[in-house]
Interface confidence: low
């Protein structure tokens, strides 16, 4: 009878999460008599994976019938693999001893490495909105993948971005890995309808990358452009003041009319016109009766957009000298 060899032919076994893994172990001799046990890891802290004689191992089955007299195959199959199952597995031969079995020989070990798919990338934008020409950061996160090699790309409206930084953690050996990437995007006024996409490619995805997206509409604030015009009414003693608020985003906008510093009306933008680029326009009117004015009227329009500081635009309504005289006569 030749000297016992414990043969574990695979040094490396790559398994996808959820699959079954077969760990092969054959022996070349039946001597010395004693059990073959499976362990994960080495040393005193090693974990018992399978013992034919005792214990409950619901996920482990033997490949051949260990009760057969001449059985030399001690291979096992572990079902429903999870990342926690990664590690090096050893089949170990014990000989009988007193009072306990004594370890006789170990196989060289089979490293089980996980093939795990990355989670769907989650893209998050900046905490606060920024205005065009400013740079905002978007973060993409994906986790739970193995092996460590992974490729991440950023796109804006389908065009690849180059200004980003990516980290894969941890740096050393692990059962699974996570990736975090931050892309810097310079905002343009037309970006309300733009999208950034994070694309993750991994060996487990078989050439079909995962994508996560974020809308720049969540990150951008386009401040309005303001225009005030006045139009005399046919009656002659009334003036229509038109206040046009153009190309703003997001929608929330409040407008306050002040006549000589006194609030005469406050309104919240409601009936908006949407532009092709996703920004909005809004028009507000104020009818001013000039017949009972004896001095020039300073009309101020105050616009508060998306909680920002109010922007003022003023217009002076000049009252004619004839009106001033009439008004002066009336007060005497």
């Amino acid at each position: 009878e030749e000297e016992l060899q414990m043969i574990q032919p695979e040094k490396l076994l790559l398994v996808a999460v959820g699959e079954s893994a077969t760990l092969n172990c054959t022996v070349t001799s039946l001597l010395p008599v004693g059990p073959v046990l499976w362990f994960r890891g080495v040393g005193p802290g090693r974990e018992l994976i399978y013992n034919q004689k005792e214990g409950h191992f619901p996920r482990v089955t033997t490949v051949s019938d260990l009760t057969k007299r001449n059985n030399m195959d001690f291979s096992i199959r572990i079902s429903s693999i999870t990342p926690a199952d990664a590690g090096t597995y050893y089949c170990v031969k014990f000989r009988k001893g007193s009072p306990e079995n004594v370890e006789f020989k170990s196989g060289p070990g089979t490293e089980m490495a996980l093939r795990a798919k990355p989670s769907a990338p989650v893209v998050s934008g900046p905490a606060a909105r920024a205005t065009p020409e400013h740079t905002v950061s978007f973060t993409c996160k994906s986790h739970g993948f193995s092996p460590r090699d992974i490729t991440l790309k950023w796109f804006k409206n389908g065009n690849e971005l180059s200004d980003f930084q990516t980290n894969v953690d941890p740096a050393g050996q692990s059962v699974s890995y996570s990736i975090r990437s931050t892309a810097r995007v310079v905002l343009a006024p037309w970006d309300v309808r733009s999208q950034v996409t994070c694309e993750v490619a991994h060996v487990t995805l078989q050439g079909d990358p995962l994508r996560g997206t974020a809308n720049l509409s969540e990150a951008i604030r386009v401040p309005p452009t303001l225009e005030v015009t006045q139009q005399p009414m046919r009656a002659g003693n009334q003036v229509n003041i038109t206040y046009q608020v153009r190309n703003f985003y997001p929608q929330n906008l409040q407008l306050t009319w002040l006549e000589n510093g006194n609030v005469c009306r406050t309104e919240t933008a409601s009936t908006l016109t949407e532009n092709k680029d996703g920004t909005y326009n809004w028009t507000s009117w104020l009818l001013v009766n000039t017949s009972d004015q004896r001095d020039d009227v300073v009309l101020t329009c105050q616009v508060k957009h998306d909680g920002q500081l109010a922007v003022n635009k003023s217009l002076v309504l000049e009252v004619s000298a004839h009106q001033k005289d009439q008004s002066s006569d009336a007060t005497h």
Epitope: Q5, E10, K11, L12, L13, L14, P108, G109, P147, D149
Partner: antibody
């Protein structure tokens, strides 16, 4: 039993490239390493490089062949490929593919492909 | 790279007699798992190489048990207990501890 079947003999001009294929049957292709070993006429065995198909495009190469050899694998057809460029007369050899466990023991060998480099 | 040195270069043998080939590595092939990553291959005339022994002493399935391997660290030996005519060819040792995998120069076994 695993069988590795290689493509046929090639005659090439110096400076050109050659691509040899190796199709595996009768066993799991992806989890094993495919190595390429060459043997010049009357000479010994020389390891060129290897690949574990499941890891995709990651291959390791002997320093001597770095930059001139490219080893690839197609999991869908269980086929490995070895491409050697900038051929010279001393590249005339029989090229073997071999299936190993991890990046070591070569348990199964192809029948070999003779590549002759001659002007 | 690990350098593998084989001896002798040529080995004339008589059928039925034992034969022995030596292989030395430039560094230890003993892995921390306790196994020596040293393989032996035989290339018969006109054929591809075939695996005989792996991990220094494990006999590959289907290989006759007249072949045996021994040794540890840097010195290894392949023994044929009783040479048969079909055993002629070139025997190579190979270290499988690290890449690049490297082979010995070969030992040509021929019948006297």
């Amino acid at each position: 039993q695993v069988q590795l079947v290689q493509s046929g003999a090639e005659v090439k001009k110096p400076g050109s490239s050659v691509k040899v294929s190796c199709k595996a049957s009768g066993g799991t292709f992806s989890n094993y390493a495919i190595s390429w070993v060459r043997q010049a006429p009357g000479q010994g065995l020389e390891w060129m490089g290897g690949i574990i198909p499941i890891f995709g495009s990651t291959a390791s190469y002997a320093q001597k062949f770095q930059g001139r050899v490219t080893i690839t694998a197609d999991e869908s057809t269980s086929t490995a490929y070895m491409e050697l460029s900038s051929l010279r007369s001393e590249d005339t050899a029989v090229y073997y593919c071999a299936r190993g466990v991890g990046d070591d023991t070569l348990t199964d060998w192809g029948q070999g492909t003779l590549v002759t480099v001659s002007s | 790279d690990i350098v593998m040195t084989q001896s002798p270069l040529s080995l004339p043998v008589t059928p039925g007699e034992p034969a022995s080939i030596s292989c030395r590595s430039s560094q230890s092939l003993l892995h921390s798992n306790g196994y020596n990553y040293l393989d032996w291959y035989l290339q018969k005339p006109g054929q591809s190489p075939q695996l005989l022994i792996y991990a220094a002493s494990s006999l590959q399935s289907g290989v006759p048990d007249r072949f045996s391997g021994s040794g540890s660290g840097t010195d290894f030996t392949l023994k044929i207990s009783r040479v048969e005519a079909e055993d002629v060819g070139v025997y190579y040792c190979m270290q499988a501890l690290q890449t690049p995998l490297t082979f010995g120069g070969g030992t040509k076994v021929e019948i006297k």
